[in-house]
Structure formats: C-alpha cells, structure tokens
C-alpha cells in the first residue's frame, strides 16, 4: 500500500511565500492529486489545487503555482500578504489526496510548523478494489 507524505516549506527570504510538497512513496498509478487546507480563513476545507496527469493543473488563491515535481510528487506555491500570512497560518493544516490505482484514495495532512520528517501514515478515504 502506498504511503503519502506532505511537507510545508516556508521561504527563508520571503515570509509571505511558502510551498506545499507532497507525494506518494511506492508503486502506484496516480490518476489525480488534490491539495487543500483546513483552518485557513474559515473552518472549512479550502481547495488549493488539483493536478491531473494528462489534463494539467488548476489552482485557486492563495495558490500561485501548482506543478508536478516528479511522476509521483507535486508542489504548490502559495503567496499572501505578510500580516495575513502570520495570523492565518498558525492553525492551518495542509492536506494532499492522491487517487491511485489500485489502492484508491490516500490522504496525508500536516501543519506548517510541524518539525517531524514529513512522512504521514496514509489514511484511506476510499478503497477501490482491483479487478
């Protein structure tokens, strides 16, 4: 079963810009990636980017750029005003959902200030059985 990882990286020189990196370890066919956050602006989950292997990427503010970093990992860059960034991000959790075959959906989340290595145990949101 694939393991999903998430890391959030603040830019050292620009406190209003940071990146969410996430990927899947192991052998699986990725059909869709959704990057979202919780606790930012309101209590609900905010979709930041959707990345499709063939049809490209789509992102929503405050996401500035979303792209594939490798065949099994993505990166989303976010930009916002510095004062807003400091106040909003303290309680924000970033989540990445990888829809893979044949393992189904795998989600991992982490917050901006967590200091562990960044490997999160995958939580199956949906299990699809292979034929």
């Amino acid at each position: 079963s694939p393991e999903v990882w998430v890391q959030v990286q603040m830019e050292a020189t620009n406190l209003s810009s940071f990146s969410v990196h996430c990927g899947v370890l192991g052998y699986s066919l990725i059909s869709l990636v959704t990057v979202s956050c919780e606790g930012f602006v309101d209590a609900g989950r905010t979709k930041l980017a959707v990345l499709h292997p063939e049809f490209g990427t789509q992102q929503w503010a405050p996401a500035r750029q979303a792209h594939w970093e490798t065949p099994n990992s993505v990166s989303v860059t976010l930009t916002m005003g510095q004062s807003k960034a400091r106040s909003s991000l303290a309680n924000t959790t970033f989540c990445c959902e990888f829809v893979t075959f044949p393992h189904g959906s795998r989600v991992a989340c982490r917050d901006l200030h967590r200091s562990d290595p960044g490997l999160s145990a995958p939580t199956p949101a949906l299990n699809l059985q292979a034929d």
Epitope: S19, T70, G118
Partner: antibody
Framework: QVQLVQSGAEVKKPGSSVKVSCKAS????????ISWVRQAPGQGLEWMGG????????NYAQKFQGRVTITADESTSTAYMELSSLRSEDTAVYYC????????????????WGQGTLVTVSS | DIQMTQSPSSLSASVGDRVTITCRAS??????LNWYQQKPGKAPKLLIY???SLQSGVPSRFSGSGSGTDFTLTISSLQPEDFATYYC????????FGGGTKVEIK
C-alpha cells in the same frame, strides 16, 4: 545550462558500502529531482531511485529498497547515493540524472546526465 | 512493475537505411515513454520525450510514435554517428528501461 559532475571511480570489498556524489552547477538544484541509474558491464540501464532535494524525500525501486540511501545537500547542490552490503553483481557504472518535465503534466525524462562513476566490487 | 520489452535486441544496418525500433509496455502507459541513445563509455542522451516530442538539438531524422503499450523509434536515414544502443524508458509508474537495441554497421 545545468551540469552534473560525479565523484571518481571506487573499488570496494564485498559487504562494504559505497557513497557516490553528484554535484549540480549552472542552475537551480532544489526544485528538480535527481535520479540514480546504474549499468552493469555490457548490460542495460536500471533505475535505482531518486530524490527531490527540497523537501528531501526519496523514492526507491523495489529491488534496491533497504540497501540504497539517496540524500541531497541543498547548500552544496550535491546529491548522494549510498549502496550497502555490496556484492560482485553491484559492479557497474552509476549515473545521476535530473528528472526534467513540463510541470503541468506528469511527463518526465532524464536530462542532463552525469558522466558516470565506475564502482568495482572485488575481494 | 511495468516491464518494457524492446525489439530487436540488435540490428545491422547501412548508412541511409530507415531503422525502426519497437518498445512494448506490459501495461498501458499512455504516452509516458522516452527514448535515449547511448554510445560506448558515454552517458545516455535524451532523444525523444513524451512518446513523440523531439528533444532540442536532436536531428529531425529521429522520430517517435505510439501510445498505450506499443511505441516506435524511427531513424529515417541512418547516419554514421547513429550507430549506438537505444533505450526506451517508461515514466508512468516510477521509471523502467527497456533492455536496449544495439544498432550496428552492416
């Protein structure tokens, strides 16, 4: 124009480890993954694994899982591949290569490549 | 793992010949297929990416086609510098290379 320069040839004893370096120059290092590929004498190419220097997460081919460790030092723009428990079958040229892609789709390829490092395992 | 099978494993041809190398994937890989050329003692060189896109600086006599499981590399008119070994590579699930095709002088 990015260039990848690898460390020199190594001769190792069976059971030992080897660590090969790959230094990038002439471009951004952190945002591009570096893969390691090996080629035994007279044989084909074999992908071992790769790493995204930022955030430093590596992915490995199942065959090498547990025996290979790929790391990267962003401050020196250098990637490393360490292979442990060496045996004679590990005698090969080891290449590093940059995973290059369009970004907006999942298409990736290897370009450029390092010059290769010959690792000889012999008692 | 996805297996990549190249054929033929070797071929003999003359300058000016049209050469075709095929690569078959053990499962559908869409167009996640690259082609490389390697000469003895040298690192591989990218020729074609995403099944049919010609890498910058590569002569137009090289072309790639195919999708799904079957792919082809064609050299329209073989030149002396084209005698080398050619590898296909899938990038759909991690990376796997084909076994290689050695193009030799007839």
């Amino acid at each position: 124009q990015v260039q990848l320069v690898q460390s020199g040839a190594e001769v190792k004893k069976p059971g030992s480890s080897v660590k090969v370096s790959c230094k990038a120059s002439g471009g951004t290092f952190g945002n591009y993954a570096i893969s390691w590929v090996r080629q035994a004498p007279g044989q084909g190419l074999e992908w071992m694994g790769g790493i995204i220097p930022i955030p430093g997460i590596a992915n490995y081919a199942q065959k090498f899982q547990g025996r290979v460790t790929i790391t990267a030092d962003e401050s020196t723009s250098t990637a490393y591949m360490e292979l442990s428990s060496l045996r004679s079958e590990d005698t090969a040229v080891y290449y590093c290569a940059r995973d290059t892609g369009r970004g907006y789709t999942r298409h990736f390829w290897f370009d450029p490549w390092g010059q290769g490092t010959l690792v000889t395992v012999s008692s | 793992d996805i297996q990549m099978t190249q054929s033929p494993s070797s071929l003999s041809a003359s300058v000016g010949d049209r050469v075709t190398i095929t690569c078959r994937a053990s499962q559908s890989i869409s167009s996640y297929l690259n082609w490389y050329q390697q000469k003895p003692g040298k690192a591989p060189k990218l020729l074609i990416y995403a099944a049919s896109s010609l890498q910058s600086g590569v002569p137009s006599r090289f072309s790639g086609s195919g999708s799904g499981t079957d792919f082809t590399l064609t050299i329209s008119s073989l030149q002396p510098e084209d005698f080398a070994t050619y590898y296909c590579q899938q990038s759909d699930i991690l990376y796997t290379f084909g076994g290689g095709t050695k193009v030799e002088i007839k």
